[in-house]
C-alpha cells in the first residue's frame, strides 16, 4: 500500500526530516508549512494548527520560503549616482546599480554600496582599459603617431592624419595640421600601428638606453594600451 500523505502539521518519523517547503518547529515538535516568498509567519504552528502566513507590508520583502516572524526591510532608496535596477516588491529587495559613467567602488551582496565616477583621460592620454560595472577606466599616454584632444572616459588615442605637407606636426594631445593645398588622408580605422620599440620619442635622437625591466609591447593597436606620449613635453 502506498504511504499516506501527511498533512501539516505532522510529527515526522524518527530520524527523518520534514519535506520541501516545510520546517520543523521545535516548540510544537511538528513538521509545519513554510510561508511562500512575499509572506511571513503571522502565527506559528501548534500540534493542531498549521502556520498562519500573512503578506509582507509595504517596503518589506521575503525572497525565499520562510517562517520568519517579520519580513525584511527593503534597502534605502537609491542615491543620485545610482539607478534602481530592481524595485522593492514583497518578494525582492531593491537593487541599486551605478548609473552610466560611474562604476561600483564598493559592492554589497546585491547591487552597489558606493558608486564613483569613471576616470576621464585628459588630452594626451587615451582609454587603455574601459571602465566596467566594477572597475575604473585606465588611461595611458598616447603613442607616437596618435593623439587624444579630449577629456573623456571613453575616447582612445586616434592616429594623426597623414599629410602630404605638414603645417604643424601632431603630438600626443593634438592632431597634425596639413597645409591646405595638400591632399590628406587619415590612417584607416583599425589599422595596426607598426611595431614600436620601447624607446620613446624622447630617446629617438640618442642610443636606446638599457631596456626597462617592465614588459615591453611588441605590437600597438589603436584600440589597445598605448605607449608613450609624442610631443608631451611641448617641444
Amino acid at each position: 500500500l502506498p504511504a499516506q500523505v501527511a498533512f501539516t502539521p505532522y510529527a515526522p518519523e524518527p530520524g527523518s526530516t520534514c519535506r520541501l517547503r516545510e520546517y520543523y518547529d521545535q516548540t510544537a515538535q511538528m513538521c509545519c508549512s513554510k510561508c511562500s516568498p512575499g509572506q511571513h509567519a503571522k502565527v506559528f504552528c501548534t500540534k493542531t494548527s498549521d502556520t498562519v502566513c500573512d503578506s509582507c507590508e509595504d517596503s518589506t520583502y521575503t525572497q525565499l520560503w520562510n517562517w520568519v516572524p517579520e519580513c525584511l526591510s527593503c534597502g534605502s532608496r537609491c542615491s543620485s549616482d545610482q539607478v534602481e535596477t530592481q524595485a522593492c516588491t514583497r518578494e525582492q529587495n531593491r537593487i541599486c546599480t551605478c548609473r552610466p559613467g560611474w562604476y561600483c567602488a564598493l559592492s554589497k551582496q546585491e547591487g552597489c554600496r558606493l558608486c564613483a565616477p569613471l576616470r576621464k583621460c585628459r588630452p594626451g592620454f587615451g582609454v587603455a582599459r574601459p571602465g566596467t560595472e566594477t572597475s575604473d577606466v585606465v588611461c595611458k599616454p598616447c603613442a607616437p603617431g596618435t593623439f587624444s584632444n579630449t577629456t573623456s572616459s571613453t575616447d582612445i588615442c586616434r592616429p594623426h592624419q597623414i599629410c602630404n605637407v605638414v603645417a604643424i606636426p601632431g603630438n600626443a594631445s593634438m592632431d597634425a595640421v596639413c597645409t591646405s593645398t595638400s591632399p590628406t588622408r587619415s590612417m584607416a580605422p583599425g589599422a595596426v600601428h607598426l611595431p614600436q620599440p620601447v624607446s620613446t620619442r624622447s630617446q629617438h635622437t640618442q642610443p636606446t638606453p638599457e631596456p626597462s625591466t617592465a614588459p615591453s609591447t611588441s605590437f600597438l593597436l589603436p584600440m589597445g594600451p598605448s605607449p608613450p606620449a609624442e610631443g608631451s613635453t611641448g617641444d
Partner: antibody, heavy 119, light 106 residues
Framework: QVQLVQSGAEVKKPGASVKVSCKAS????????IHWVRQAPGQGLEWMGW????????DYADKFKKRVTMTADTSISTAFMELSRLRSDDTAVYYC????????????WGQGTLVTVSS | DIQMTQSPSSLSASVGDRVTITCNGA??????LAWFQQKPGKAPKLLIY???SLQTGVPSRFSGSRSGTDFTLTISSLQPEDFATYFC????????FGGGTKLELK
C-alpha cells in the same frame, strides 16, 4: 593607503651616475605613470620626465634627454631614475609622483631623495 | 615648452588675510593647471587641479580661478599652517612648474 617610498640620500662625485628608486604601494602600480621632479637647494620644482611602468615607455624633458634613464620593475612595484654624467648643479632633492592620466595630476609624492654631487 | 610666470615670488601676510597668487601661461593651456603647496623639507602637496577642483581633504579656504591666461590661487583667510611655498603647474602641453611664491608671516 597610497605610498611612494624613495631610496636614501646619495653623495656622488662629478661624472658619476646615480640611481634613485621609488617603491609604490596601496594602488595598482601599472595603472599610473610615475613622474620625476627635482628641486635644487632653495630653488623651484623642475619636471624631468615620466615612465609608464606598464610598458616601460618614457618621455623626458629636453634638458635631461641625453643623461636620464627611467625604468620600472613591475614585480616589485618600483620605478627608477638614473642620471649620468653628474655635475655639481645636479645637487638636488629628487621626487617621484604618480599620475593616472586624468585631470587629477600628481596626487601622491615620494618623500624625496637628496643627491649631493661634490668632488 | 609653455613658460609659467608666477607672481609674486614672495609675499608677507598675516593670519586671517585674504591672499592671491597668480600664474600666467603664455599660450592656451585649457584648464590643466594645478597648484601645489610645499613646506620646508617636505614633498609638494596637491591643493587644486584642473584650475578649480579642490583635492580631497584640502580646506575650502583654498580656491582656484582663471581669467584668460591668468590663473589665480586664493586663500580666503590665512591660517598659521598655510605659510609655505606655492607652485603652479601646467600639464596641458608638456609639464611646467611656475617659479614659486614664498608666503611668509608678516
Amino acid at each position: 593607503q597610497v605610498q611612494l617610498v624613495q631610496s636614501g640620500a646619495e653623495v656622488k662625485k662629478p661624472g658619476a651616475s646615480v640611481k634613485v628608486s621609488c617603491k609604490a604601494s596601496g594602488y595598482t602600480f601599472t595603472d599610473y605613470i610615475i613622474h620625476w621632479v627635482r628641486q635644487a637647494p632653495g630653488q623651484g620644482l623642475e619636471w624631468m620626465g615620466w615612465i609608464d611602468p606598464d610598458y616601460g615607455n618614457t618621455d623626458y624633458a629636453d634638458k635631461f634627454k641625453k643623461r636620464v634613464t627611467m625604468t620600472a620593475d613591475t614585480s616589485i612595484s618600483t620605478a627608477f631614475m638614473e642620471l649620468s654624467r653628474l655635475r655639481s648643479d645636479d645637487t638636488a632633492v629628487y621626487y617621484c609622483a604618480r599620475d593616472d592620466g586624468s585631470p587629477l595630476v600628481m596626487d601622491a609624492w615620494g618623500q624625496g631623495t637628496l643627491v649631493t654631487v661634490s668632488s | 615648452d609653455i613658460q609659467m610666470t608666477q607672481s609674486p615670488s614672495s609675499l608677507s601676510a598675516s593670519v586671517g588675510d585674504r591672499v592671491t597668487i597668480t600664474c600666467n601661461g603664455a599660450q592656451n593651456i585649457d584648464n590643466y593647471l594645478a597648484w601645489f603647496q610645499q613646506k620646508p623639507g617636505k614633498a609638494p602637496k596637491l591643493l587644486i587641479y584642473s584650475t578649480y577642483s579642490l583635492q580631497t581633504g584640502v580646506p575650502s579656504r583654498f580656491s582656484g580661478s582663471r581669467s584668460g591666461t591668468d590663473f589665480t590661487l586664493t586663500i580666503s583667510s590665512l591660517q598659521p599652517e598655510d605659510f609655505a611655498t606655492y607652485f603652479c603647474f601646467q600639464y596641458n602641453n608638456g609639464y611646467m612648474f611656475g617659479g614659486g611664491t614664498k608666503l611668509e608671516l608678516k
